[in-house]
Interface confidence: low
């Protein structure tokens, strides 16, 4: 009853959604196969081949625990742990091996359980080259005299839309938050719309190191102001890493419950479902842009 969520790595285990109901069960990924006969070649990497009417389904029943023990895959993506890497290999029916313990050096900030759906593939892995890892959309300028991470984020022309960020600073537009994050090479999140006020407390905001590894920066309990702490969002405790597959985990202390704030294009309780039905509109240079 109080074991870590999920189970051990590897295949097997029952999925509540049942056969083929992958939309209701994020742990069961089903891949349609063109081959009409179940054999070793039609369902590899730990998948279970199942005949389903005229076609086949390759069920990847991996019950992966959600602990953040990142590994870098041979496809250049960071996986939350080795089980997620194996599950991705099964899901896509392609070989993915562990090429490094720890996250891939990348600026895409993926690190999710399904890292293969983010980033740009193998070229990401050693993108840092001489620069060291450039994150938060920074690019390595190897031709520059002082080799380093360069930020080419252009925020000129953005409309005035002030926000309060996790570093306690106010920015005139969300774009400037991204720019600051890029320049400082550290995670800075938008806390709320509008300028920061005296009541804003940054002690609970935490920082995001790699992917879904949200770490509360709170060093002792006395720093936690009650008015912020109870009934408001705080970063999820570390043993909930991976609770949100494609989104940010937020924890409401008064209810002791986590909720997921999904990234654009994802939905579901754990932001595990791809949602192409939503048209996202964001302000950009005085005009509306479809994302």
């Amino acid at each position: 009853s109080n074991q870590p969520p999920g189970g051990g790595g590897g295949s097997g285990g029952d999925c509540p959604g049942g056969k083929g109901k992958s939309i209701n069960c994020s742990e069961l990924n089903v891949r349609e196969s063109d081959v009409r006969v179940c054999d070793e070649s039609s369902c590899k990497y730990g998948g279970v081949c199942k005949e389903d009417g005229d076609g086949l389904k390759c069920a990847c029943q991996f019950q992966c625990h959600t602990n953040y023990i990142p590994v870098c895959g041979s496809n250049g993506d960071t996986y939350q742990n080795e089980c997620f890497l194996r599950r991705a290999a099964c899901k896509h029916q392609k070989e993915i091996t562990v090429i490094a313990r720890g996250p891939c050096y990348s600026d895409n900030g993926s690190g999710s359980g399904e890292g293969e759906e983010e980033g740009s593939g193998a070229e990401v892995h050693r993108k840092h080259s001489k620069c060291g890892p450039c994150k938060y959309k920074a690019e390595c300028d190897e031709d520059a005299e002082n080799v380093g991470c360069v930020c080419n984020i252009d925020c000129s022309g953005y409309s005035f839309n002030p926000v309060c960020a996790s570093d306690g600073s106010s920015y005139n537009n969300p774009c400037f938050v991204r720019e600051a994050s890029c320049i400082k090479q550290e995670q800075i999140d938008i806390r709320h719309l509008g300028h920061c006020t005296d009541t804003d407390d940054t002690s609970l905001l935490g920082k995001k190191d790699d992917g879904l590894q949200y770490r509360p920066d709170v060093k002792d309990a006395s720093d936690q102001r009650e008015d912020v702490y109870i009934g408001n969002h705080m970063p999820c405790p570390e043993n909930l890493n991976g609770y949100c597959i494609h989104g940010k985990c937020e924890f409401i202390y008064s209810t002791q419950k986590a909720s997921c704030r999904c990234e654009s294009g994802y939905t579901g309780q754990h932001c595990e479902k791809t949602d192409f039905s939503i048209l996202y509109v964001v302000p950009s240079r005085q005009k509306l842009t479809h994302v």
């Epitope: 109080n2 870590p4 625990h65 023990i69 060093k219 570390e238 043993n239 008064s254 002791q256 986590a258």
Partner: antibody, heavy 124, light 107 residues
Framework: QVQLQESGPGLVKPSETLSLTCAVS?????????WGWIRQPPGKKLEWIGS???????YYNPSLKSRVTMSVDTSKNQFSLKLSSVTAADTAVYYC?????????????????WGRGTLVTVSS | DIQMTQSPSSLSASVGDRVTITCRAS??????LAWYQQKPGKVPKLLIY???TLQSGVPSRFSGSGSGTEVTLTISSLQSEDFAVYYC?????????FGGGTKLEIK
């Protein structure tokens, strides 16, 4: 079977620093859970000292925070407690324990596994 | 800090009796409460968490109920091995705090 075992000196002089270590066997502390320290003065109730995660994130009891330092050594699968400037009031049985984990988006900060406890006496 | 007050502080009962121990919180704690049993010279043992969820391996004669500021632990039919000190602990808010304990003795 997961087991926790405290170790450290049973006698500490006033104003010195109390140092205890908790060795965990049967479970990798890097795999999850928070790990805590609780103490119990003779004949008195339990008092939470603080908790630590394998990354080093700590949560301390405000009443002790100025004197407490907790650390973790994942390579040795152990975590430690240091309590500085001790007085006779710090005489207690010190327990290390595993805190309940988060599941289904809900966290349970109770203690499901305890070490045997070690009596630390502060006396000159 | 949230203060946890247990009542009674001591209780005498006989084998087979039904016993109820109450834990009151100085402010609402929802159901974020655990109960522990501690025998003399022994380590505290988790009995119940989330106010009413029985920890694995704990006999079903133990049960918990309530939420908010008042939570109770009930032992439906006392056994000789149940005589011990019982502590409640809230985990709705840091710092985590324990009750003063209820000593359950043989009448």
């Amino acid at each position: 079977q997961v087991q926790l075992q405290e170790s450290g000196p049973g006698l500490v002089k006033p104003s010195e620093t109390l140092s205890l270590t908790c060795a965990v066997s049967g479970y990798s502390i890097s795999s999850g859970y928070f790990w805590g320290w609780i103490r119990q003065p003779p004949g008195k109730k339990l008092e939470w000292i603080g908790s630590i995660y394998h990354s080093g994130s700590t949560y301390y009891n405000p009443s002790l925070k100025s004197r407490v330092t907790m650390s973790v050594d994942t390579s040795k699968n152990q975590f430690s407690l240091k309590l500085s400037s001790v007085t006779a009031a710090d005489t207690a049985v010190y327990y290390c324990a595993r805190e309940g984990d988060c599941s289904g988006g809900i966290c349970y900060w109770y203690f499901d596994l305890w070490g045997r406890g070690t009596l630390v006496t502060v006396s000159s | 800090d949230i203060q946890m007050t247990q009542s009674p502080s001591s209780l005498s009962a006989s084998v087979g009796d039904r016993v109820t121990i109450t834990c009151r919180a100085s402010q609402g704690i929802s159901n974020y409460l655990a109960w522990y049993q501690q025998k003399p010279g022994k380590v505290p043992k988790l009995l119940i968490y989330a106010a009413s969820t029985l920890q694995s391996g704990v006999p079903s004669r133990f049960s918990g109920s309530g939420s908010g500021t008042e939570v109770t632990l009930t032992i439906s039919s006392l056994q000789s091995e149940d005589f011990a000190v019982y502590y409640c602990q809230q985990y709705n808010k840091w710092p985590l705090t324990f009750g003063g304990g209820t000593k359950l003795e043989i009448k």
